[in-house]
Interface confidence: low
Amino acid sequence: KLTIESTPFNVAEGKEVLLLVHNLPQHLFGYSWYKGERVDGNRQIIGYVIGTQQATPGPAYSGREIIYPNASLLIQNIIQNDTGFYTLHVIKSDLVNEEATGQFRVYPELPKPSISSNNSKPVEDKDAVAFTCEPETQDATYLWWVNNQSLPVSPRLQLSNGNRTLTLFNVTRNDTASYKCETQNPVSARRSDSVILNVLYGPDAPTISPLNTSYRSGENLNLSCHAASNPPAQYSWFVNGTFQQSTQELFIPNITVNNSGSYTCQAHNSDTGLNRTTVTTITVYAEPPKPFITSNNSNPVEDEDAVALTCEPEIQNTTYLWWVNNQSLPVSPRLQLSNDNRTLTLLSVTRNDVGPYECGIQNKLSVDHSDPVILNVLYGPDDPTISPSYTYYRPGVNLSLSCHAASNPPAQYSWLIDGNIQQHTQELFISNITEKNSGLYTCQANNSASGHSRTTVKTITVSAELPKPSISSNNSKPVEDKDAVAFTCEPEAQNTTYLWWVNGQSLPVSPRLQLSNGNRTLTLFNVTRNDARAYVCGIQNSVSANRSDPVTLDVLYGPDTPIISPPDSSYLSGANLNLSCHSASNPSPQYSWRINGIPQQHTQVLFIAKITPNNNGTYACFVSNLATGRNNSIVKSITVSASGTSPGLSA
């Protein structure tokens, strides 16, 4: 079927469009183009006769149309009126006619837009501003940008008039920004220049600096006032209600006690018509007063709170000094002094930070000291300790347990046996115990100020028979020539003798072996690989004796200097080279090879088939023990002779 395709469909004014004909029939006499959706002689643009290859303009021909032999029509220098439908009338040789209609739309190349505003100096929290994107253009889409970002979502921003108008209600100083608008249609998009919104605001409540309010007689008083304001504020000063001057700064040289009083700064914005004031009270001392320390936290909690100690009063041009425990301040990342040295901050206080603290003010002849201040640091309770440490008792003796936990204020204690509350005391006493008194003894310590509690549980066994002991170790994998190991025989029992055996023999005499803690603890200093033996402890009293299971010490060592085998260093060409590397090490080492410094495989054995003189060189075996963090290596030179030149025999 005959069809017309417009390329492009949307055309910019001044550009060109091609009405492309598809499925043109065979055996044609000629064809004509018409403006509109039907064949109308008055609206003929151009006709074309194939036989003569003659094009004839029609009444609607504008001089901008070109017809091609394939019936396509090119229209150049497009104008708005060209929008619409175009009909192709095809006359076949058999005089049977065919028609097809196509269309395109014409859009203007958009001009660069500009922004108009209904209010060039809006007042904060009072005025609205409406920006309008000019000119108004048919079939155009309008977009807005604030600081080159698309519009934020805000109830104070409203688009209207087909997005042509952007209204900001109740403007704020934060609306001072760069605004741009953009127009788009199917053939173009243009952005305006920026418009900067100038929002009038303030004055805010002024701030008077410096902040200090105490001065010494004879000093200069220099106060400065500032209030956020657009346009900038005009300032006035009043002392005790009496107008002084219309300046931003107030300067009074060589002040006396008579200059004490209330100082008021008034800020005025002539455009908004608003005034704001701030008052500061200035005290002038004839001589510096005795300093004193104020604290922002009288009962700080350990590891939780910070404490700021401030030396009062605040006096301008004064040197402040601090002492802790009658010493000058130690260097510590937890101690921080403010810029003027007036405030000492203790970050994350500990129980050792109690003080006493003193501050001083330097005057002409001496230093005035404050009274000392002690910090009451709340801490704990720490994990309570139950004493004595015995866990085995014989029937008939008295059980007397005492509990203690470091705490401020002092902890309150409770005792539980097998989870049942017994008494609220620091000591627990039970006379003439029996096997029935065996169980779990819990001491609970509570700090009422911090609300924290900690508990310790001890298993008490009352028995005539001693239990089977066990060995605990402080280091399960010691490193040779570096670590020490302490074995302890558990449990701790009253009136008990402790014994030790190594590989079934009593302890050898050695300066590296030491017994302590009533022979309960055996310490091996600077362990060696030969200490990797079976250790057994025994306990005995007048009634019974018992031995532990053996504990074997796993000593990490090596790697020692490796050995490469076979030892041969000369080979014949064509032989297989099979080098094996071994190093004493616990755990087993990792092996790697290098030939002439070039890394090879990570294996214990290096195999090269049919070697030649090209394989001459240095063969290095590297060993590393990840557990000890130690490395070792050995290098071997290999010489390969060409056949028949070997200095030795070959197999």
Partner: antibody
Framework: QVQLVQSGAEVKKPGASVKVSCKAS????????MHWVRQAPGQGLEWMGW????????EYAPKFQGRVTMTRDTSISTAYMELSRLRSDDTAVYYC?????????????WGQGTLVTVSS | DIQMTQSPSSLSASVGDRVTITCRAS?????MHWYQQKPGKAPKLLIY???NLASGVPSRFSGSGSGTDFTLTISSLQPEDFATYYC?????????FGGGTKLEIK
């Protein structure tokens, strides 16, 4: 005819910066915006921003704000895109594209692409 | 940012089939562009401003839609049409592309 020729592939370490160039011919660079679009391996297309070579104005995608800098040298008809503080997920092919300043931001001319690999 | 969701993400079809690819925007956009990309090559513009065929693109490609829903249609698939197709919105910064639709031979 319009042509955009980009600089060659780059391999960079994390934390480093890369600067890709795009030389234009067949049109006046001042009459166009130069856009930059990237494509991570096996992923889709991601627009980074544009520069107006006439005055140096830029528009960056928020994702790249603070890390990307687009510049130009009109005397040699070349646009540049520099990306700093590189991460491994910046590995991508970076394309420059020409778009008319009045145009509706579509890209009918593309550079051949520059592969930037970020690896430690 | 306006998110562009293309469906389907991949599609198997035969030569001669009619194929439709959909692109949905997370908020309303004014126009949509479509690109075709073949492996190892830069993308190629197919359709701009929703329905306009780019220069040299065959008429079997067409585009339509408005608001948030747009479609690319290939009326009769040809062997050279097997590629990945991307949509792109141009209404709001940052400009964003769809995740792509890979068109494969069945």
């Amino acid at each position: 005819q319009v042509q955009l020729v980009q600089s060659g592939a780059e391999v960079k370490k994390p934390g480093a910066s890369v600067k890709v160039s795009c030389k234009a011919s067949g049109f006046n660079i001042k009459d166009s915006y130069m856009h930059w679009v990237r494509q991570a391996p096996g992923q889709g297309l991601e627009w980074m921003g544009w520069i107006d070579p006439e005055n140096g104005d830029t528009e960056y995608a928020p994702k790249f704000q603070g890390r990307v800098t687009m510049t130009r040298d009109t005397s040699i008809s070349t646009a540049y895109m520099e990306l700093s503080r590189l991460r491994s997920d910046d590995t991508a092919v970076y394309y420059c594209n020409e778009g008319t300043p009045t145009g509706p931001y579509y890209f009918d001319y593309w550079g051949q692409g520059t592969l930037v690999t970020v690896s430690s | 940012d306006i998110q562009m969701t293309q469906s389907p993400s991949s599609l198997s079809a035969s030569v001669g089939d009619r194929v439709t690819i959909t692109c949905r925007a997370s908020s309303s956009v004014s126009y949509m562009h479509w690109y075709q990309q073949k492996p190892g090559k830069a993308p190629k513009l197919l359709i701009y401003s929703t329905s306009n065929l780019a220069s040299g693109v065959p008429s079997r490609f067409s585009g339509s839609g408005s608001g948030t829903d747009f479609t690319l249609t290939i009326s009769s698939l040809q062997p050279e049409d097997f590629a990945t197709y991307y949509c792109q919105q141009r209404s709001s910064y940052p400009l964003t592309f769809g995740g792509g639709t890979k068109l494969e031979i069945k």
